[in-house]
């Protein structure tokens, strides 16, 4: 169908104001532009209201070359004021003006909301010359309009350094409802009420909302947007969506899954990363969280020993990182380790148990009966001790570490010696005369160095002094031993 209206040529075109002469353009081509010399080209809208002349921005032409008469002011003829159309439809609208033939080089440009429309738009200007005037029709077409095409469109014509501006054509694009708020996926407690929100806008308004649960409509009567659906509670997972309806049709929101919170699945892949004598570093892969964030985890440790009482040590830790260092363990012991995690609903089952062992420990006691004496003829110090009574967990004795500190006139020097496990005596060279030598001994296993014995002091005189009296580890409670010569 062609919408066409004819307007007589008048020196002052009637201007009825921006009457909402909008065209519904869903099924019509807006403009047909045949030209016959007997009338002005077709306009989109034939105003029915009483009008008035233009009073605004018009170009006043100069006197003609003959100097005989003035030409009428130039102004665009009034066209449709408002076009309402659906998204994805095509639209075509126009500006028309009659220009006396004395004018040359007229150019028409299209503007939208104050910005010139350049490039990828379909703007066509057609000229229809007559004896005295040329009718100019500038058409603008948009294929498959989008909401972003909404706006106020005007024509501008440059003529003799004058700018003539048309009245605006308001383009209002309507379409299917557009969601401004869609329901969100949620994790809910079983049989507990929750809300879902859906909001959609036009134009056109109003927008009505239907809720859908697992493909079935929830509400028989539509609700005006925005709509809040209160679900009294679920016992199993469900999928919800909302339908937004307006005069143009319906839009369906994304489907969202509503999950029921449950206890987590047990952790998997408990792994040993590092073992020491008294600690084990473990990690695990969390199980499924049951649609509720993990709060914390529990590491359970049982000693694997027929003689142990089978008690379980429990260590609580944060859920992240999925790693924990179990401390305060016995050296050279075997343990069974499991992990369980909890969310707001409860604790998971325990992971599969894994076996882990601690390594040898360092000795827990120092060598006994340490004695020190000076062998002046050889210029060395003899040291003797008794092997400490170490526990099995400390592991096999591999040797001893001897610390000897030499102090003289404000100078102090510490030296360390390592001796094998079969020894229970050692000799060290005198480092400084006229000095005090302080000796301490520690037992060493693969698990590390044990505690040092209490210090034993011996005075090393200047050359020529002789003393064979030993210095030895004191009985408990005595002052530090010092050999006095």
């Amino acid at each position: 169908a062609i919408t066409e209206a004819r307007e007589e040529a008048k020196p002052y075109p009637l201007f009825p104001g921006p009457l909402p002469g909008s065209l519904q353009t869903d099924h019509t081509s807006l403009l047909s532009l045949p030209h016959t010399s007997g009338y002005q080209p077709a306009l989109m809208f034939s105003p029915t209201q009483p009008g008035r002349p233009y009073t605004g921005n018009v170009a006043i032409p100069r006197v003609t070359s003959a100097g005989s008469k003035l030409l009428p002011p130039l102004a665009f003829k009034h066209t449709v004021g408002h076009i309402i159309l659906s998204e994805h439809k095509d639209v075509k609208f126009n500006c028309s003006i009659s220009v006396p033939n004395i004018y040359q080089d007229t150019t028409i440009s299209w503007w939208k909301d104050g910005k010139e429309l350049l490039g990828a738009h379909h703007a066509i200007t057609q000229f229809y010359p007559d004896d005295e005037v040329t009718a100019i029709i500038a058409s603008f077409s948009i294929t498959s309009v989008q909401r972003s095409d909404n706006g106020s469109y005007i024509c501008k014509m440059k003529i003799n350094n004058e700018e003539i501006v048309s009245d605006p054509i308001y383009i209002e694009v309507q379409g299917l409802p557009h969601f401004t708020k869609q329901p969100e996926s949620m994790n809910v407690t079983r049989n507990t009420a929750f809300n879902l929100t859906c909001q959609a806008v036009g134009p056109p308004e109003p927008v009505n909302i239907f809720w859908v649960q697992n493909s079935s409509r929830v509400n028989e009567q539509p609700e005006k947007s925005p709509s809040v659906l209160t679900v009294p509670g679920l016992t199993e997972m469900a999928v919800f969506s909302c339908e937004a309806h307006n005069d143009k049709g319906l839009t369906v929101s994304k489907g969202v899954q509503i999950n029921i919170k449950a206890i987590p699945s047990p952790p998997t892949e408990v792994s040993i990363h590092n073992s020491t004598a008294h600690s084990i570093l473990i990690s695990w892969v969390p199980g499924f969280d049951g649609y509720s964030p993990f709060r914390n985890c529990s590491v359970q440790v049982k000693e694997v020993d027929p003689l142990s009482n089978g008690s379980v040590m429990i260590f609580n830790t944060s859920a992240s990182p999925h790693m924990y260092q179990i401390k305060q363990l016995q050296a050279l012991a075997n343990y069974s380790i499991g992990v369980s995690c909890m969310n707001e609903i409860g604790w998971s089952a325990v992971s599969p148990w894994i076996l882990a062992s601690t390594t040898e420990g360092a000795p827990s006691v120092a060598p006994l009966n340490v004695t020190v004496f000076l062998n002046e003829s050889r210029d060395n110090v003899d040291i003797r001790w008794m092997k400490p009574l170490t526990k099995r967990q400390a592991g096999e004795l591999v040797g001893y570490r001897i610390s000897h500190v030499w102090q003289s006139a404000g100078i102090s020097k510490e030296l360390l010696e390592e001796v094998g496990q079969n020894n229970s005596r050692a000799q060290i060279s005198v480092q400084v005369h006229n000095a005090t030598c302080t000796v301490r001994i520690a037992a060493v296993t693969k698990g590390g160095v044990g505690p040092f014995s209490d210090p034993v002091k011996i005075f090393i005189p200047a050359h020529g002094w002789v003393d064979h009296a030993p210095s030895s580890t004191p009985a408990p409670g005595n002052a530090d031993p010092v050999l006095i010569i």
Epitope: P20, Q24, P50, D113, S152, I154, S166, P168, E172
Partner: antibody, heavy 118, light 112 residues
Framework: QVQLQQSGPELVKPGTSVKISCKAS????????IHWVKQRPGQGLDWIGW????????QYNEKFKGKATLTADTSSSTAYMQLSSLTSEDSAVYYC???????????WGQGTSVTVSS | DAVMTQTPLSLPVSLGDQASISCRSS???????????LHWYLQKPGQSPQLLIY???NRFSGVQDRFSGSGSGTDFTLKISRVEAEDLGVYFC?????????FGSGTKLEIK
């Protein structure tokens, strides 16, 4: 966001003229009609007319022809209404409003009170 | 001119009640294109009018869904489903189909 800021209250003498302003912001001033509306104390609303700033075309309600003159300054995005030969009947609050794409007066100025008193 | 007759002049309501305002035009407001340019406004005390409903039934952006409009031709209705304290003020209809544009005389919504 669209805003229309009107000039302050006016106290004028009968027989004189007054010019009130409406400064637009937040949209293309030259692309949308500006309408003017009169509201007398405790009474309804009366449409005065419109101006299209893009080309300064105007349309008046017959009741206000000769009383109101509408102009626009595009460089400052300001519309003006001059009221002449003022009488006590012209004492009112005058609003400017934009005719939006939906062809409704979608945004309004805060109003300018004009009091005509000797 | 298209004369807009609005009723009632005053509408006392209790909060939470439904309110209904009528606007009747002396001539049809349907344009040749089939659209009807009848709008509803609320003017709160000491404020400018604010647009509620445009073209009979379309809610303007930000307007609560309590407000709805209906009608055609010459008879139009604005409904407020559950009146709240912030809804109090004077309601106007406005037609922009015919020049001059004309307003209804206003309906004052007040608490009983």
């Amino acid at each position: 966001q669209v805003q229309l800021q009107q000039s302050g209250p006016e106290l004028v003498k009968p027989g004189t003229s007054v010019k009130i302003s409406c400064k637009a912001s937040g949209y293309s001033f030259t692309s949308y009609y500006i309408h003017w509306v009169k509201q007398r104390p405790g009474q309804g609303l009366d449409w005065i007319g419109w101006i299209f700033p893009g080309n300064r075309n105007t349309q008046y309600n017959e009741k206000f022809k000769g009383k109101a003159t509408l102009t626009a300054d595009t460089s400052s995005s300001t519309a003006y209404m001059q009221l002449s030969s003022l009488t006590s009947e012209d004492s009112a609050v005058y609003y400017c409003a934009r005719l939006g794409l939906i062809y409704a007066l979608d945004y309004w100025g805060q109003g300018t009170s004009v009091t005509v008193s000797s | 001119d298209a004369v807009m007759t609005q009723t009632p002049l005053s509408l006392p309501v209790s909060l939470g009640d439904q309110a209904s305002i009528s606007c009747r035009s002396s001539q049809s407001l349907e344009n040749s294109n089939g659209h009807t340019y009848l709008h509803w406004y609320l003017q709160k005390p000491g404020q400018s009018p604010q647009l509620l409903i445009y073209r009979v039934s379309n809610r303007f952006s930000g307007v609560q869904d309590r407000f709805s409009g209906s009608g055609s031709g010459t008879d139009f209705t604005l409904k407020i489903s559950r009146v709240e304290a912030e809804d109090l003020g004077v309601y106007f209809c406005l037609q922009v189909t015919h020049v001059p544009f004309t307003f209804g005389s206003g309906t004052k919504l007040e608490i009983k």
